[in-house]
Interface confidence: medium
């Protein structure tokens, strides 16, 4: 059998506080426990949930937790079910509410000497006790013709007079706690001789040169006085108007009319009502001159088809606040649809190419109207007009590769060469239409080129291969002057390239044929043994079918190459003595000799008195100094070749002979003494 070890019991609970209804069962087999509230199963929520077999309340709620709770234990195998005793909460609570007018039915009906009843809408359990306040001061029951009914929660004033005017509030407390009125009531019972406001002037905004009207009315017994003042306390009457208010009229009903309003009329206007008794009532209203500033410019916008975009129109500063609307093609945009206005925004949903164009934001108020256009471009993916084609370009000439595309906005085109971006320089130029110009085509320009055309909507690309049609040219051009060594073997190369492999042949410039010891082997002129007669002018001719022929003229000189008869030797000289560096060369043409000392050429015309170069090429240096030490190079050259040889010159101090040393001992180096 199922036995309840602990049963839920009825208990006091506080609104919004924790509570627990206990339930514990014992049974031979497994049972599952659930709860009923007024016979209906209780569903777990974050506020009220099963905790083991017990029911836990995180925050008791007087409305949702009122009723009878029961714990039910059920054996799902046998079907046996047991129910606990009923339990309920005695929930204590208090809830704030406003002070309201119970009698008369409306504030307008409150008159001096009538009964006024106020009700305090604070409720709770147990029933709270109430306390009333006027202007924050507690009211005690039976004091100065008012009664407090705690049961009715009412405050009755009989009869009500001006002395009862004030702010009424109430508080209540019970065992649960205390609460004060959430909204208080202002009772105003005026003395009839006091001025009361019937109609208060309102702020007005007018356009320049328009008219403005302020209404102002007071009532009192006897009737009150009314006066208008402008900013600097200057009274405005029909008899005495200030200079800047010449066009002001005060009507019998108290209204003030200003015609042809100017900026100097803008400001604060005061309407003052004075009753027989009581303080004056001062009402203020401001006259604003309507104004509207210029609108900021829009940047042109580029959108992509299919997207959703918004353009915000910032209304210009103005008074009154300008109203804003969008137009397209002269038609005001609707507030819904695919292209519509939402607030100050222009909304384009699922943009189509046809949405491109000029949209105008308008702003207007009393001061006038402003407008600003925004140009909307709907970007499209570029399409081909002309793709780059595999091309044959001529070497040395300008070459063009097309990349003609169309799109909105105008696409940007970039070119790549062998996957490297081409930056414009002296050789490459990209025209506005996307065509690439290679200013002077080189052989190595023969490669892959790729152009990419892009807009914000996307890009397309294509590639082409360039074949360079080579110029018929010598590679390299033969040297126009060349030397051959007499009595030796010599070769003069000549090679050329072109669209087609050229044939190359040599001729003597005078047209005579080449002697038998001179052969022309695939462009190389070969002299088995050079003779004096081989000197002269020769022409290398390269030719092919498509390109014709080209010629290179070469003047061949036969020379005996330079040899040194006498070479300078390593020389050591005493300081102050003369050094002689000998050098003599032979060859044909006869070589000229130059000297280089200390890494600079010794110019014979600028040698000075200490140095001299003899006709045979020897160099003499008089009165040598330590700074003359160094390497000296003899350079022999003619029109055909150049040779050099070098030797060091050492300058030393003359030694003083020691006693032990015989006068005949030789120095440890070759010495020149003069």
């Amino acid at each position: 059998a199922i036995v309840f070890i602990k049963q839920p019991s009825s208990q006091d609970a506080l609104q919004g506080r924790r509570a627990l209804l206990r339930c514990e069962v014992e049974a031979p087999g497994p049972v599952h426990v659930y709860w009923l509230l007024d016979g209906a199963p209780v569903q777990d929520t974050e506020r009220r949930f099963a905790q083991g077999s017990s029911l836990s309340f995180a925050a008791v709620d007087r409305l949702q937790d009122s009723g009878t709770f029961q714990c039910v234990a059920r054996d799902d195998v046998t079907g046996e079910e047991a129910r606990s005793a009923n339990a309920s909460f005695n929930i204590k609570w208090i809830e704030a509410g406003p002070v309201v007018l119970k009698h008369p039915a409306s504030e307008a009906e409150i008159q001096p000497q009538t009964q006024v009843t106020l009700r305090c809408h604070i409720d709770g359990h147990p029933r709270p006790t109430y306390q009333w306040f006027r202007d924050g001061t507690p009211l005690s029951d039976g004091q100065s013709n008012h009664t407090v009914s705690s049961k009715e929660r009412n405050l009755t004033l009989r009869p009500a007079g001006p002395e009862h005017s004030g702010l009424y509030s109430c508080c209540a407390h019970s065992a649960f706690g205390q609460a004060c009125s959430s909204q208080n009531f202002t009772l105003s019972i005026a003395d009839e001789s006091f001025a009361r406001v019937v109609l208060a002037p309102q702020d007005v905004v007018v356009a320049r040169y328009e008219e403005a009207m302020f209404h102002c009315q007071f009532s009192a017994q006897p009737p009150p006085s009314l006066q208008w003042l402008f900013e600097d306390e200057t009274p405005i009457t029909n008899r005495s108007r200030p200079p800047h208010l010449r066009r002001a009229t005060v009507f019998a009903n108290g209204s003030l009319l200003l015609t042809q309003v100017r900026p100097r009329n803008a400001g604060i206007y005061r309407c003052i009502g004075q009753g027989q008794r009581g303080p004056p009532i001062i009402l203020e209203a401001t006259l604003h001159l309507a104004e509207i500033e210029d609108m900021p410019l829009f940047e042109p916008r580029v959108f992509t088809a299919g997207s959703e975009e918004r353009v915000t129109c910032l209304p210009p500063k103005g008074l009154p606040e300008p109203s804003v609307w969008w137009e397209h093609a002269g038609v005001r945009l609707p507030t819904h649809g695919r292209v519509y206005q939402k607030g100050h925004e222009l909304v384009l949903a699922n943009i189509a190419e046809s949405d491109a164009g000029v949209y105008t934001c308008h702003a207007a108020n009393l001061a006038g109207q402003r407008r600003q256009d925004v140009n909307i471009t709907v970007a499209t993916v570029p399409s081909w007009l002309k793709k780059p084609q595999d091309s044959q370009l001529e070497e040395g000439k300008p070459g063009y590769l097309d990349c003609l595309t169309q799109a909105t906005p105008k696409p940007t085109v970039v070119w790549y060469r062998n996957q490297m971006l081409i930056s414009e320089d002296s050789r490459f130029e990209v025209f506005k239409n996307g065509t690439l110009r290679i200013n002077s085509v080189e052989v190595y320009d023969g490669t892959w080129y790729r152009c990419m055309s892009s807009t914000p909507a996307g890009s397309i690309e294509a590639q082409a291969r360039v074949q360079v049609l080579e110029k018929l040219k010598f590679t390299p051009p033969p040297q126009p002057q060349q030397c051959m060594e007499f009595d030796k073997e010599a070769t003069v190369p000549c090679s050329a390239t072109g669209r087609e492999k050229p044939t190359i042949k040599w001729e003597r410039a005078d047209g005579s044929s080449l002697p038998e010891w001179v052969t022309d082997n695939a462009g190389t002129l070969h002299f088995a043994r050079v003779t004096r007669d081989d000197a002269g002018n020769y022409t290398c001719i390269a030719s092919n079918g498509p390109q014709g022929q080209i010629r290179a003229h070469v003047q061949l000189t036969v020379a005996v190459f330079i040899t040194f008869k006498v070479e300078p030797e390593r020389t050591t000289v005493y300081q102050g003595h003369t050094a002689l560096l000998q050098c003599e060369a032979q060859g044909d043409p006869k070589p000229l000799i130059q000297w280089k000392g200390k890494d600079r050429i010794l110019d014979p015309t600028k040698l000075g008195p200490r140095m001299h170069i003899f006709q045979n090429g020897s160099l003499v240096i008089h009165d040598v100094a330590p700074e003359d030490s160094g390497r000296y190079t003899c350079i022999a050259g003619n029109s055909c070749n150049i040779k050099h040889t070098e030797a060091p010159l050492y300058v030393v101090d003359k030694p003083v002979p020691e006693e032990s040393e015989g006068p005949g001992s030789p120095p440890p180096y070759k010495m020149i003494q003069t």
Epitope: E500, K501, G545
Partner: antibody
Framework: EVQLVESGGGLVKPGGSLRLSCAAS????????MNWVRQAPGKGLEWVSS????????YYADSVKGRFTISRDNAKNSLYLQMNSLRAEDTAVYYC?????????WGQGTLVTVSS | EIVLTQSPGTLSLSPGERATLSCRAS???????LAWYQQKPGQAPRLLIY???SRATGIPDRFSGSGSGTDFTLTISRLEPEDFAVYYC?????????FGQGTKVEIK
């Protein structure tokens, strides 16, 4: 003496294929660009395709692009033209010609007839 | 592509007369790359002139070429019986290589 001899022409149905050959002799074949030029009956000359000496650069007329393939075998001194998806307007005498655009030597031609 | 237009379409002349054939290009190109060919019925074309004015090997000197830019001319100074044929101009400066439609020189 430079000689170019074409072969492989004949009658073929529209949509069919044919392979033309050109045997070259009398010059260094591997040094020259080679071409195919055709002439429709009673019409003028039309350049068809070109291949450079090393088969690096190949060009086609727009009218045959994607259908014809030019190739060469330098070891065999031979030039080829594989023609697929043939049309009636491809009917012509096909000449093999030597040169980089300048056709200095021509074969005697082979007739290709495309007809159903 | 460069379009070559030959004129006249047919030229009727007698042997011994001078023949002047014209070839006009749709765009300017280097005169180094204009050639003239002769074709007789049932034969392959034969190269006559290249580089606008250079005679190919074995071509008689009565054939001469001239012109530059877009206008080119082939002149046969004295027509021989064997010269009656169709003549084609061709540009080989830029692919696609293109031919003129031909001028037929026939016996009057």
């Amino acid at each position: 003496e430079v000689q170019l001899v074409e072969s492989g022409g004949g009658l073929v149905k529209p949509g069919g294929s044919l392979r033309l050959s050109c045997a070259a002799s009398g010059f260094t074949f591997s040094s020259y660009s080679m071409n195919w030029v055709r002439q429709a009956p009673g019409k003028g000359l039309e350049w068809v395709s070109s291949i450079d000496s090393s088969s690096s650069f190949i060009y086609y007329a727009d009218s045959v692009k994607g259908r014809f393939t030019i190739s060469r075998d330098n070891a065999k001194n031979s030039l080829y033209l594989q023609m697929n998806s043939l049309r009636a307007e491809d009917t012509a005498v096909y000449y093999c010609a030597r040169g980089t655009g300048l056709f200095d030597f021509w074969g005697q031609g082979t007739l290709v007839t495309v007809s159903s | 592509e460069i379009v070559l237009t030959q004129s006249p379409g047919t030229l009727s002349l007698s042997p011994g007369e001078r023949a002047t054939l014209s070839c006009r290009a749709s765009q300017s190109f280097s005169s180094s790359y204009l050639a003239w060919y002769q074709q007789k019925p049932g034969q392959a074309p034969r190269l006559l002139i290249y580089g606008a004015s250079s005679r190919a090997t074995g071509i008689p000197d009565r054939f001469s070429g001239s012109g530059s830019g877009t206008d080119f001319t082939l002149t046969i100074s004295r027509l021989e019986p064997e010269d009656f044929a169709v003549y084609y101009c061709q540009q080989y400066g830029r692919t696609p290589w293109t031919f003129g439609q031909g001028t037929k020189v026939e016996i009057k």
